[in-house]
Protein backbone atom coordinates (compact mmCIF):
# COMPACT_ATOMS: atom_id res chain seq x y z
CA UNK A 1 0.00 0.00 0.00
CA UNK A 2 -0.87 2.73 -0.86
CA UNK A 3 -2.87 1.23 -3.69
CA UNK A 4 -1.97 2.31 -7.22
CA UNK A 5 -3.31 5.61 -8.50
CA UNK A 6 -2.22 8.62 -10.47
CA UNK A 7 -0.78 10.27 -7.38
CA UNK A 8 -1.10 10.42 -3.65
CA UNK A 9 -3.67 12.53 -1.89
CA UNK A 10 -2.24 15.74 -0.45
CA UNK A 11 -3.27 17.92 2.45
CA UNK A 12 -3.01 21.56 1.41
CA UNK A 13 -2.60 24.36 3.91
CA UNK A 14 -0.47 27.48 4.33
CA UNK A 15 2.64 27.01 6.41
CA UNK A 16 1.79 30.12 8.41
CA UNK A 17 -1.44 31.95 9.20
CA UNK A 18 -1.59 35.35 10.90
CA UNK A 19 -4.42 36.31 13.22
CA UNK A 20 -5.11 39.35 15.36
CA UNK A 21 -5.39 39.31 19.12
CA UNK A 22 -9.05 39.23 20.10
CA UNK A 23 -10.24 38.56 16.56
CA UNK A 24 -11.15 35.32 14.86
CA UNK A 25 -8.99 33.50 12.34
CA UNK A 26 -9.49 30.59 9.98
CA UNK A 27 -6.86 27.88 9.75
CA UNK A 28 -7.37 26.64 6.17
CA UNK A 29 -6.85 22.94 5.46
CA UNK A 30 -8.02 20.99 2.42
CA UNK A 31 -7.59 17.49 1.09
CA UNK A 32 -6.56 17.50 -2.55
CA UNK A 33 -7.38 14.28 -4.35
CA UNK A 34 -5.77 13.81 -7.77
CA UNK A 35 -8.09 12.98 -10.67
CA UNK A 36 -7.92 9.18 -10.76
CA UNK A 37 -7.39 8.73 -7.05
CA UNK A 38 -10.27 7.63 -4.81
CA UNK A 39 -10.44 8.28 -1.10
CA UNK A 40 -12.94 8.12 1.73
CA UNK A 41 -12.49 10.49 4.65
CA UNK A 42 -13.89 9.32 7.97
CA UNK A 43 -12.41 11.87 10.36
CA UNK A 44 -10.83 15.32 10.53
CA UNK A 45 -8.61 16.14 13.47
CA UNK A 46 -6.89 19.27 14.70
CA UNK A 47 -4.29 19.06 17.42
CA UNK A 48 -1.73 21.40 18.84
CA UNK A 49 1.95 20.58 19.18
CA UNK A 50 2.99 19.96 22.75
CA UNK A 51 -0.53 19.32 23.98
CA UNK A 52 -2.07 15.96 24.67
CA UNK A 53 -5.25 15.08 22.85
CA UNK A 54 -6.98 16.82 20.00
CA UNK A 55 -8.63 20.22 20.07
CA UNK A 56 -11.21 19.58 17.36
CA UNK A 57 -12.49 16.42 15.72
CA UNK A 58 -15.09 15.96 13.02
CA UNK A 59 -16.17 12.34 12.72
CA UNK A 60 -18.31 11.17 9.85
CA UNK A 61 -20.97 9.71 12.16
CA UNK A 62 -20.45 11.67 15.37
CA UNK A 63 -20.05 15.12 13.85
CA UNK A 64 -17.93 17.82 15.50
CA UNK A 65 -16.37 17.78 18.96
CA UNK A 66 -14.26 20.56 20.39
CA UNK A 67 -12.00 21.00 23.39
CA UNK A 68 -13.31 24.59 23.63
CA UNK A 69 -16.74 24.61 21.96
CA UNK A 70 -17.23 28.37 22.25
CA UNK A 71 -13.92 29.14 20.53
CA UNK A 72 -13.70 26.57 17.75
CA UNK A 73 -15.79 25.71 14.71
CA UNK A 74 -15.33 23.64 11.59
CA UNK A 75 -16.01 26.06 8.76
CA UNK A 76 -17.23 23.69 6.06
CA UNK A 77 -17.40 20.12 7.42
CA UNK A 78 -20.97 18.84 7.67
CA UNK A 79 -22.48 15.45 8.43
CA UNK A 80 -23.50 13.59 5.29
CA UNK A 81 -21.04 15.43 3.05
CA UNK A 82 -17.62 14.49 1.74
CA UNK A 83 -15.10 15.61 4.31
CA UNK A 84 -12.53 17.36 2.15
CA UNK A 85 -12.36 20.72 3.91
CA UNK A 86 -11.04 20.65 7.48
CA UNK A 87 -10.70 24.42 7.82
CA UNK A 88 -11.11 25.46 11.44
CA UNK A 89 -12.20 28.84 12.77
CA UNK A 90 -10.82 30.09 16.06
CA UNK A 91 -12.59 32.89 17.90
CA UNK A 92 -11.25 35.41 20.39
CA UNK A 93 -7.57 34.83 19.64
CA UNK A 94 -5.31 34.85 22.66
CA UNK A 95 -1.55 35.19 22.87
CA UNK A 96 -1.28 31.61 24.06
CA UNK A 97 -2.98 30.39 20.87
CA UNK A 98 0.20 31.11 18.95
CA UNK A 99 1.92 27.89 17.97
CA UNK A 100 2.04 24.92 15.65
CA UNK A 101 -1.13 23.05 14.76
CA UNK A 102 -1.62 19.77 12.92
CA UNK A 103 -4.52 19.25 10.55
CA UNK A 104 -5.10 15.56 9.91
CA UNK A 105 -7.41 13.61 7.61
CA UNK A 106 -8.19 9.95 8.34
CA UNK A 107 -8.72 8.40 4.93
CA UNK A 108 -9.31 5.03 3.33
CA UNK A 109 -7.49 3.35 1.75
CA UNK A 110 -4.51 5.70 2.07
CA UNK A 111 -4.34 6.14 5.84
CA UNK A 112 -3.95 9.44 7.61
CA UNK A 113 -2.47 12.51 5.99
CA UNK A 114 -1.50 15.63 7.87
CA UNK A 115 0.05 19.04 7.56
CA UNK A 116 1.43 21.50 10.10
CA UNK A 117 0.35 25.14 10.28
CA UNK A 118 2.00 27.86 12.35
CA UNK A 119 -0.51 30.31 13.82
CA UNK A 120 0.98 33.71 14.52
CA UNK A 121 -1.00 35.90 16.87
CA UNK A 122 -0.46 39.56 15.98
CA UNK A 123 -1.53 42.74 17.67
CA UNK A 124 -1.60 45.92 15.62
CA UNK A 125 0.19 48.66 17.54
CA UNK A 126 -1.03 52.21 17.97
CA UNK A 127 1.64 54.75 17.12
CA UNK A 128 2.19 58.26 18.39
CA UNK A 129 5.01 60.73 18.10
CA UNK A 130 5.51 63.87 20.13
CA UNK A 131 8.05 66.59 20.62
CA UNK A 132 10.10 66.73 23.77
CA UNK A 133 10.50 70.46 24.35
CA UNK A 134 14.00 71.26 25.55
CA UNK A 135 16.29 74.14 26.41
CA UNK A 136 19.93 74.64 25.50
CA UNK A 137 21.47 72.02 27.75
CA UNK A 138 24.84 71.70 26.06
CA UNK A 139 24.57 67.92 26.25
CA UNK A 140 22.53 65.28 24.37
CA UNK A 141 18.87 65.09 25.45
CA UNK A 142 15.70 63.56 23.95
CA UNK A 143 14.05 66.00 21.56
CA UNK A 144 11.40 63.69 20.13
CA UNK A 145 9.58 60.62 21.37
CA UNK A 146 7.95 57.92 19.25
CA UNK A 147 5.80 55.26 20.93
CA UNK A 148 4.34 52.12 19.36
CA UNK A 149 1.86 50.75 21.87
CA UNK A 150 0.64 47.18 22.23
CA UNK A 151 2.29 45.52 19.26
CA UNK A 152 2.86 41.82 18.83
CA UNK A 153 5.54 41.17 17.81
CA UNK A 154 7.22 44.43 18.90
CA UNK A 155 7.21 47.15 16.25
CA UNK A 156 10.49 48.26 14.69
CA UNK A 157 11.17 51.99 15.03
CA UNK A 158 13.75 53.95 13.04
CA UNK A 159 14.37 57.69 12.67
CA UNK A 160 15.13 59.88 9.70
CA UNK A 161 16.86 63.18 10.37
CA UNK A 162 19.22 65.64 8.71
CA UNK A 163 20.14 67.11 12.07
CA UNK A 164 22.37 64.39 13.42
CA UNK A 165 21.55 62.68 16.67
CA UNK A 166 20.97 59.10 17.71
CA UNK A 167 18.07 56.90 18.82
CA UNK A 168 17.50 55.33 22.21
CA UNK A 169 14.90 52.57 22.00
CA UNK A 170 13.40 50.51 24.80
CA UNK A 171 10.64 47.95 25.23
CA UNK A 172 8.08 47.34 27.96
CA UNK A 173 5.13 44.96 28.34
CA UNK A 174 1.96 46.26 26.72
CA UNK A 175 -1.40 46.63 28.41
CA UNK A 176 -2.57 43.31 26.96
CA UNK A 177 -0.58 40.24 27.95
CA UNK A 178 1.95 39.27 25.31
CA UNK A 179 2.02 42.64 23.64
CA UNK A 180 4.94 45.05 23.69
CA UNK A 181 5.17 48.81 23.80
CA UNK A 182 8.25 50.18 22.07
CA UNK A 183 9.47 53.66 22.98
CA UNK A 184 12.15 55.35 20.93
CA UNK A 185 13.74 58.71 21.76
CA UNK A 186 15.68 60.87 19.31
CA UNK A 187 18.62 62.34 21.15
CA UNK A 188 20.81 65.27 20.17
CA UNK A 189 22.52 68.36 21.58
CA UNK A 190 19.88 71.12 21.36
CA UNK A 191 20.71 74.28 19.46
CA UNK A 192 18.72 77.18 18.11
CA UNK A 193 19.32 75.81 14.61
CA UNK A 194 17.33 72.69 15.56
CA UNK A 195 14.25 74.61 16.66
CA UNK A 196 11.40 74.28 14.19
CA UNK A 197 13.15 71.61 12.18
CA UNK A 198 11.54 68.18 11.82
CA UNK A 199 12.52 64.55 12.33
CA UNK A 200 10.52 61.55 11.13
CA UNK A 201 9.76 58.42 13.11
CA UNK A 202 9.22 55.32 10.94
CA UNK A 203 7.27 52.45 12.50
CA UNK A 204 7.34 49.05 10.81
CA UNK A 205 5.12 46.13 11.80
CA UNK A 206 3.98 43.03 9.95
CA UNK A 207 0.37 44.07 10.49
CA UNK A 208 0.94 47.23 8.43
CA UNK A 209 0.63 47.29 4.67
CA UNK A 210 3.37 49.92 4.64
CA UNK A 211 5.46 51.63 7.32
CA UNK A 212 3.84 54.45 9.25
CA UNK A 213 5.68 57.76 9.12
CA UNK A 214 5.17 60.25 11.92
CA UNK A 215 6.76 63.68 11.65
CA UNK A 216 7.77 65.66 14.72
CA UNK A 217 8.53 69.37 14.64
CA UNK A 218 11.22 70.02 17.20
CA UNK A 219 11.06 72.69 19.85
CA UNK A 220 14.19 74.12 21.44
CA UNK A 221 13.72 76.96 23.89
CA UNK A 222 16.58 79.46 23.78
CA UNK A 223 17.19 83.07 24.77
CA UNK A 224 17.26 85.72 22.05
CA UNK A 225 19.96 85.71 19.41
CA UNK A 226 20.26 89.39 18.50
CA UNK A 227 21.73 91.38 15.63
CA UNK A 228 21.09 94.89 14.29
CA UNK A 229 20.58 95.52 10.58
CA UNK A 230 19.92 98.54 8.39
CA UNK A 231 23.28 100.30 8.52
CA UNK A 232 25.54 100.15 5.48
CA UNK A 233 28.42 102.40 6.59
CA UNK A 234 27.28 105.11 4.19
CA UNK A 235 25.18 107.52 6.20
CA UNK A 236 25.66 111.25 5.58
CA UNK A 237 24.43 114.52 6.92
CA UNK A 238 21.25 116.10 5.57
CA UNK A 239 19.83 112.86 4.27
CA UNK A 240 16.42 111.26 4.81
CA UNK A 241 15.70 109.52 8.07
CA UNK A 242 16.89 105.94 8.36
CA UNK A 243 15.88 102.87 10.32
CA UNK A 244 17.83 100.31 12.30
CA UNK A 245 16.13 96.96 12.92
CA UNK A 246 16.82 94.75 15.89
CA UNK A 247 16.70 91.21 14.50
CA UNK A 248 15.99 88.68 17.22
CA UNK A 249 15.48 84.93 16.97
CA UNK A 250 14.23 83.28 20.11
CA UNK A 251 11.86 80.68 21.49
CA UNK A 252 9.60 81.69 23.00
CA UNK A 253 9.09 84.91 21.06
CA UNK A 254 10.66 88.13 22.43
CA UNK A 255 8.59 89.90 25.02
CA UNK A 256 10.40 93.22 24.81
CA UNK A 257 12.92 95.35 22.91
CA UNK A 258 14.93 98.05 24.64
CA UNK A 259 17.14 100.50 22.70
CA UNK A 260 19.95 102.49 24.32
CA UNK A 261 23.46 103.65 23.65
CA UNK A 262 26.74 103.00 25.32
CA UNK A 263 26.45 106.51 26.73
CA UNK A 264 23.06 105.81 28.26
CA UNK A 265 19.62 106.80 27.00
CA UNK A 266 18.86 107.42 23.34
CA UNK A 267 19.76 110.83 21.89
CA UNK A 268 16.89 113.03 20.65
CA UNK A 269 17.43 112.10 16.98
CA UNK A 270 16.87 108.39 17.75
CA UNK A 271 13.30 107.19 18.39
CA UNK A 272 12.58 103.59 19.48
CA UNK A 273 9.59 101.90 17.86
CA UNK A 274 9.67 98.33 19.21
CA UNK A 275 12.18 96.34 17.20
CA UNK A 276 13.00 99.37 15.10
CA UNK A 277 15.01 102.48 15.82
CA UNK A 278 14.20 105.54 13.76
CA UNK A 279 17.22 107.83 13.08
CA UNK A 280 16.10 111.31 12.13
CA UNK A 281 18.29 113.57 9.98
CA UNK A 282 21.14 115.25 11.88
CA UNK A 283 23.02 118.47 11.11
CA UNK A 284 26.39 117.52 12.47
CA UNK A 285 28.44 114.32 12.31
CA UNK A 286 27.80 111.68 14.94
CA UNK A 287 29.52 108.52 16.07
CA UNK A 288 27.18 106.59 18.36
CA UNK A 289 27.03 102.97 19.44
CA UNK A 290 23.45 101.76 19.71
CA UNK A 291 22.45 98.84 21.88
CA UNK A 292 19.37 96.66 21.33
CA UNK A 293 18.44 94.55 24.33
CA UNK A 294 15.90 91.80 23.67
CA UNK A 295 14.08 89.88 26.37
CA UNK A 296 12.17 86.61 26.31
CA UNK A 297 11.07 84.12 29.00
CA UNK A 298 14.55 82.65 29.15
CA UNK A 299 16.50 85.86 29.52
CA UNK A 300 17.90 88.92 27.78
CA UNK A 301 20.55 89.28 25.10
CA UNK A 302 21.85 92.38 23.33
CA UNK A 303 23.63 93.50 20.21
CA UNK A 304 25.63 96.68 19.55
CA UNK A 305 26.12 98.65 16.37
CA UNK A 306 28.24 101.77 15.91
CA UNK A 307 26.72 104.26 13.53
CA UNK A 308 28.68 107.09 11.94
CA UNK A 309 26.95 109.96 10.17
CA UNK A 310 29.57 111.69 8.07
CA UNK A 311 29.91 114.82 6.01
CA UNK A 312 29.54 113.59 2.51
CA UNK A 313 30.06 114.90 -0.97
CA UNK A 314 27.10 116.96 -2.23
CA UNK A 315 26.78 114.60 -5.17
CA UNK A 316 25.60 111.84 -2.84
CA UNK A 317 22.82 113.42 -0.84
CA UNK A 318 20.81 110.28 -0.32
CA UNK A 319 23.42 107.97 1.22
CA UNK A 320 21.64 107.73 4.56
CA UNK A 321 18.26 106.83 3.18
CA UNK A 322 17.36 103.24 3.83
CA UNK A 323 13.56 103.30 3.62
Amino acid sequence: WPPPGTGDIIVQAPTQVPGFLGDSVTLPCYLQVPGMEETHVSQLTWSRHGESGSMAVFHQTQGPNYSEPKRLEFVAARLGTELRDASLRMFGLRVEDEGNYTCLFVTFPQGSRSVDIWLRVLAKPQNTAEVQKVQLTGKPVPVARCVSTGGRPPAHITWHSDLGGMPNTSQAPGFLSGTVTVTSLWILVPSSQVDGKSVTCKVEHESFEKPQLLTVNLTVYYPPEVSISGYDNNWYLSQNEATLTCDARSNPEPTGYNWSTTMGPLPPFAVAQGAQLLIRPVDKPINTTFICNVTNALGARQAELTVQVKEGPPSEPSGMSSN
Epitope: H40, T45, Q60, N65, G80, F108, S114
Partner: antibody, heavy 115, light 107 residues
Framework: EVQLQQSGPELVKPGASVKISCKTS????????MHWVKQSHGESLEWIGG????????NYNQNFKGKATLTVDKSSSTAYMELRSLTSEDSAVYYC????????WGQGTSVTVSS | DIVMTQSQKFMSTSVGDRVSVTCKAS??????VAWYQQKPGQSPKALIY???YRYRGVPDRFTGSGSGTDFTLTISNVQSEDLADYFC?????????FGSGTKLEIK
Protein backbone atom coordinates in the same frame (compact mmCIF):
# COMPACT_ATOMS: atom_id res chain seq x y z
CA GLU B 1 -30.66 2.21 13.46
CA VAL B 2 -27.52 0.88 11.81
CA GLN B 3 -27.41 -2.91 11.66
CA LEU B 4 -24.87 -5.36 10.25
CA GLN B 5 -26.27 -8.89 9.89
CA GLN B 6 -23.72 -11.59 9.19
CA SER B 7 -24.26 -15.03 7.72
CA GLY B 8 -24.34 -18.07 9.97
CA PRO B 9 -21.55 -20.31 11.27
CA GLU B 10 -19.48 -22.33 8.83
CA LEU B 11 -17.86 -25.71 9.23
CA VAL B 12 -15.46 -26.30 6.34
CA LYS B 13 -12.77 -28.75 5.38
CA PRO B 14 -9.09 -27.81 5.09
CA GLY B 15 -8.22 -26.47 1.63
CA ALA B 16 -11.76 -25.33 0.96
CA SER B 17 -13.07 -21.80 0.62
CA VAL B 18 -15.85 -19.96 2.41
CA LYS B 19 -17.70 -16.74 1.63
CA ILE B 20 -19.17 -14.79 4.54
CA SER B 21 -21.80 -12.10 3.99
CA CYS B 22 -22.60 -8.94 5.92
CA LYS B 23 -25.94 -7.36 5.08
CA THR B 24 -26.30 -3.76 6.18
CA SER B 25 -29.32 -1.62 6.94
CA UNK B 26 -30.16 1.68 8.57
CA UNK B 27 -27.76 3.80 6.52
CA UNK B 28 -26.63 4.48 2.97
CA UNK B 29 -24.36 1.54 2.15
CA UNK B 30 -21.84 3.58 0.18
CA UNK B 31 -21.42 6.11 2.98
CA UNK B 32 -19.16 4.02 5.25
CA UNK B 33 -16.15 1.87 4.56
CA MET B 34 -16.53 -1.77 5.56
CA HIS B 35 -13.84 -3.72 7.39
CA TRP B 36 -13.29 -7.31 8.43
CA VAL B 37 -11.72 -8.43 11.68
CA LYS B 38 -10.58 -11.88 12.81
CA GLN B 39 -10.76 -13.04 16.42
CA SER B 40 -9.23 -16.41 17.14
CA HIS B 41 -10.54 -18.20 20.22
CA GLY B 42 -9.62 -16.22 23.33
CA GLU B 43 -7.29 -14.04 21.30
CA SER B 44 -7.07 -10.42 20.33
CA LEU B 45 -8.54 -8.78 17.25
CA GLU B 46 -6.77 -8.75 13.90
CA TRP B 47 -7.69 -6.44 11.05
CA ILE B 48 -7.98 -8.31 7.76
CA GLY B 49 -8.77 -5.44 5.43
CA GLY B 50 -11.33 -2.91 4.33
CA UNK B 51 -13.31 -1.92 1.29
CA UNK B 52 -14.94 1.31 0.14
CA UNK B 53 -18.38 0.28 -1.16
CA UNK B 54 -18.54 3.47 -3.19
CA UNK B 55 -15.76 2.50 -5.58
CA UNK B 56 -14.64 -0.97 -4.56
CA UNK B 57 -11.23 0.27 -3.42
CA UNK B 58 -9.60 -2.10 -0.95
CA ASN B 59 -6.75 -2.20 1.52
CA TYR B 60 -5.53 -5.51 2.93
CA ASN B 61 -3.36 -6.46 5.84
CA GLN B 62 -0.29 -8.09 4.26
CA ASN B 63 -0.90 -11.13 6.48
CA PHE B 64 -4.19 -11.77 4.67
CA LYS B 65 -3.24 -11.01 1.08
CA GLY B 66 -4.05 -14.10 -0.94
CA LYS B 67 -6.15 -15.44 1.92
CA ALA B 68 -9.06 -12.97 1.95
CA THR B 69 -10.93 -11.24 -0.85
CA LEU B 70 -13.34 -8.41 -0.07
CA THR B 71 -16.23 -7.50 -2.34
CA VAL B 72 -19.52 -5.62 -2.13
CA ASP B 73 -22.90 -5.79 -3.81
CA LYS B 74 -24.30 -2.28 -3.77
CA SER B 75 -27.73 -3.41 -4.98
CA SER B 76 -28.28 -5.47 -1.85
CA SER B 77 -26.13 -3.33 0.50
CA THR B 78 -24.10 -6.39 1.32
CA ALA B 79 -20.38 -6.87 1.90
CA TYR B 80 -18.63 -10.19 1.39
CA MET B 81 -15.39 -11.76 2.48
CA GLU B 82 -14.12 -14.90 0.82
CA LEU B 83 -11.46 -16.96 2.60
CA ARG B 84 -9.61 -19.58 0.58
CA SER B 85 -7.17 -22.43 1.12
CA LEU B 86 -8.44 -22.78 4.64
CA THR B 87 -6.37 -24.36 7.41
CA SER B 88 -7.01 -24.87 11.10
CA GLU B 89 -5.25 -21.53 11.66
CA ASP B 90 -8.20 -19.87 9.98
CA SER B 91 -10.66 -21.17 12.55
CA ALA B 92 -11.96 -18.05 14.24
CA VAL B 93 -14.85 -15.64 14.59
CA TYR B 94 -14.94 -13.11 11.76
CA TYR B 95 -16.60 -9.74 12.17
CA CYS B 96 -17.62 -7.15 9.66
CA UNK B 97 -17.44 -3.61 10.99
CA UNK B 98 -18.41 -0.29 9.46
CA UNK B 99 -16.66 3.10 9.60
CA UNK B 100 -13.16 3.98 10.75
CA UNK B 101 -12.67 3.58 13.63
CA UNK B 102 -14.85 0.49 13.77
CA UNK B 103 -18.12 1.82 15.09
CA UNK B 104 -20.74 -0.62 13.88
CA TRP B 105 -20.10 -4.37 14.27
CA GLY B 106 -21.84 -7.44 12.98
CA GLN B 107 -22.63 -10.25 15.41
CA GLY B 108 -19.74 -12.33 14.09
CA THR B 109 -19.51 -15.45 11.98
CA SER B 110 -17.81 -18.52 13.39
CA VAL B 111 -15.68 -20.43 10.90
CA THR B 112 -14.39 -23.83 11.94
CA VAL B 113 -11.90 -25.60 9.71
CA SER B 114 -11.88 -29.31 10.45
CA SER B 115 -11.58 -32.52 8.52
CA ASP C 1 3.59 -1.82 10.86
CA ILE C 2 2.51 -0.17 14.09
CA VAL C 3 2.29 -2.36 17.17
CA MET C 4 -0.13 -1.53 19.97
CA THR C 5 0.97 -2.86 23.35
CA GLN C 6 -1.38 -3.38 26.30
CA SER C 7 0.97 -4.51 29.03
CA GLN C 8 -1.72 -5.41 31.57
CA LYS C 9 -3.41 -8.64 30.51
CA PHE C 10 -5.68 -8.66 33.56
CA MET C 11 -6.87 -6.02 35.96
CA SER C 12 -8.88 -6.62 39.08
CA THR C 13 -11.06 -3.93 40.57
CA SER C 14 -14.07 -3.43 42.80
CA VAL C 15 -17.42 -1.84 42.06
CA GLY C 16 -17.15 1.92 42.60
CA ASP C 17 -13.41 1.99 42.07
CA ARG C 18 -11.47 3.78 39.36
CA VAL C 19 -9.28 1.82 36.98
CA SER C 20 -6.96 2.83 34.14
CA VAL C 21 -6.10 0.66 31.17
CA THR C 22 -2.99 1.73 29.27
CA CYS C 23 -1.89 1.26 25.69
CA LYS C 24 1.37 2.14 23.95
CA ALA C 25 1.90 2.63 20.21
CA SER C 26 5.23 1.72 18.63
CA UNK C 27 5.25 5.07 16.81
CA UNK C 28 3.35 8.35 16.76
CA UNK C 29 -0.31 7.84 15.88
CA UNK C 30 -1.39 11.36 16.86
CA UNK C 31 -4.80 10.92 18.51
CA UNK C 32 -5.99 8.25 16.09
CA VAL C 33 -6.78 5.67 18.74
CA ALA C 34 -10.08 3.98 19.53
CA TRP C 35 -11.09 1.88 22.52
CA TYR C 36 -13.44 -1.10 22.39
CA GLN C 37 -15.26 -3.08 25.04
CA GLN C 38 -16.03 -6.75 24.43
CA LYS C 39 -18.23 -8.53 26.89
CA PRO C 40 -18.18 -12.33 27.00
CA GLY C 41 -19.92 -13.84 23.99
CA GLN C 42 -20.57 -10.46 22.34
CA SER C 43 -19.17 -8.39 19.50
CA PRO C 44 -16.81 -5.56 20.36
CA LYS C 45 -18.47 -2.23 21.12
CA ALA C 46 -16.84 1.09 20.26
CA LEU C 47 -16.37 3.33 23.31
CA ILE C 48 -13.88 6.04 22.39
CA TYR C 49 -12.59 7.55 19.15
CA UNK C 50 -9.80 10.07 18.53
CA UNK C 51 -8.25 9.06 21.87
CA UNK C 52 -10.64 11.04 24.04
CA TYR C 53 -14.10 11.39 22.50
CA ARG C 54 -16.94 9.17 23.66
CA TYR C 55 -19.35 7.72 21.14
CA ARG C 56 -22.94 8.76 21.69
CA GLY C 57 -24.58 6.63 24.33
CA VAL C 58 -21.34 5.65 26.07
CA PRO C 59 -21.53 6.42 29.83
CA ASP C 60 -19.38 9.34 30.90
CA ARG C 61 -17.55 7.18 33.43
CA PHE C 62 -15.47 6.02 30.42
CA THR C 63 -12.75 8.57 29.66
CA GLY C 64 -9.96 8.37 27.09
CA SER C 65 -6.78 10.39 27.06
CA GLY C 66 -3.37 10.62 25.43
CA SER C 67 -1.75 11.38 22.12
CA GLY C 68 1.35 10.39 20.23
CA THR C 69 2.30 7.01 21.64
CA ASP C 70 0.74 6.76 25.11
CA PHE C 71 -2.97 6.28 25.68
CA THR C 72 -5.21 5.55 28.63
CA LEU C 73 -8.79 4.41 29.09
CA THR C 74 -10.07 5.31 32.55
CA ILE C 75 -13.23 3.83 34.04
CA SER C 76 -14.36 5.71 37.10
CA ASN C 77 -17.02 4.36 39.44
CA VAL C 78 -16.66 0.86 37.98
CA GLN C 79 -19.95 -1.06 37.63
CA SER C 80 -20.42 -4.80 37.56
CA GLU C 81 -21.52 -4.59 33.90
CA ASP C 82 -18.07 -3.24 33.02
CA LEU C 83 -16.62 -6.76 33.32
CA ALA C 84 -15.20 -7.19 29.83
CA ASP C 85 -12.12 -7.21 27.63
CA TYR C 86 -10.88 -3.77 26.57
CA PHE C 87 -8.93 -3.28 23.34
CA CYS C 88 -7.14 -0.23 22.02
CA UNK C 89 -6.72 0.24 18.29
CA UNK C 90 -4.76 2.66 16.12
CA UNK C 91 -6.30 3.88 12.89
CA UNK C 92 -3.60 6.33 11.87
CA UNK C 93 -2.17 4.04 9.22
CA UNK C 94 -2.78 0.66 7.63
CA UNK C 95 -2.84 -2.08 8.65
CA UNK C 96 -5.16 -1.09 11.49
CA UNK C 97 -3.74 -2.61 14.66
CA PHE C 98 -5.33 -3.67 17.93
CA GLY C 99 -3.77 -4.09 21.32
CA SER C 100 -3.76 -7.58 22.82
CA GLY C 101 -6.54 -6.63 25.23
CA THR C 102 -6.93 -6.15 28.97
CA LYS C 103 -9.45 -8.28 30.85
CA LEU C 104 -11.20 -6.37 33.62
CA GLU C 105 -12.28 -8.57 36.48
CA ILE C 106 -14.65 -7.45 39.22
CA LYS C 107 -13.72 -8.59 42.72
Amino acid sequence: EVQLQQSGPELVKPGASVKISCKTSGYTFTEYTMHWVKQSHGESLEWIGGIDPNNGGTNYNQNFKGKATLTVDKSSSTAYMELRSLTSEDSAVYYCAGVIPLEYWGQGTSVTVSS
Amino acid sequence: DIVMTQSQKFMSTSVGDRVSVTCKASQNVYTNVAWYQQKPGQSPKALIYSASYRYRGVPDRFTGSGSGTDFTLTISNVQSEDLADYFCQQYNSYPLAFGSGTKLEIK
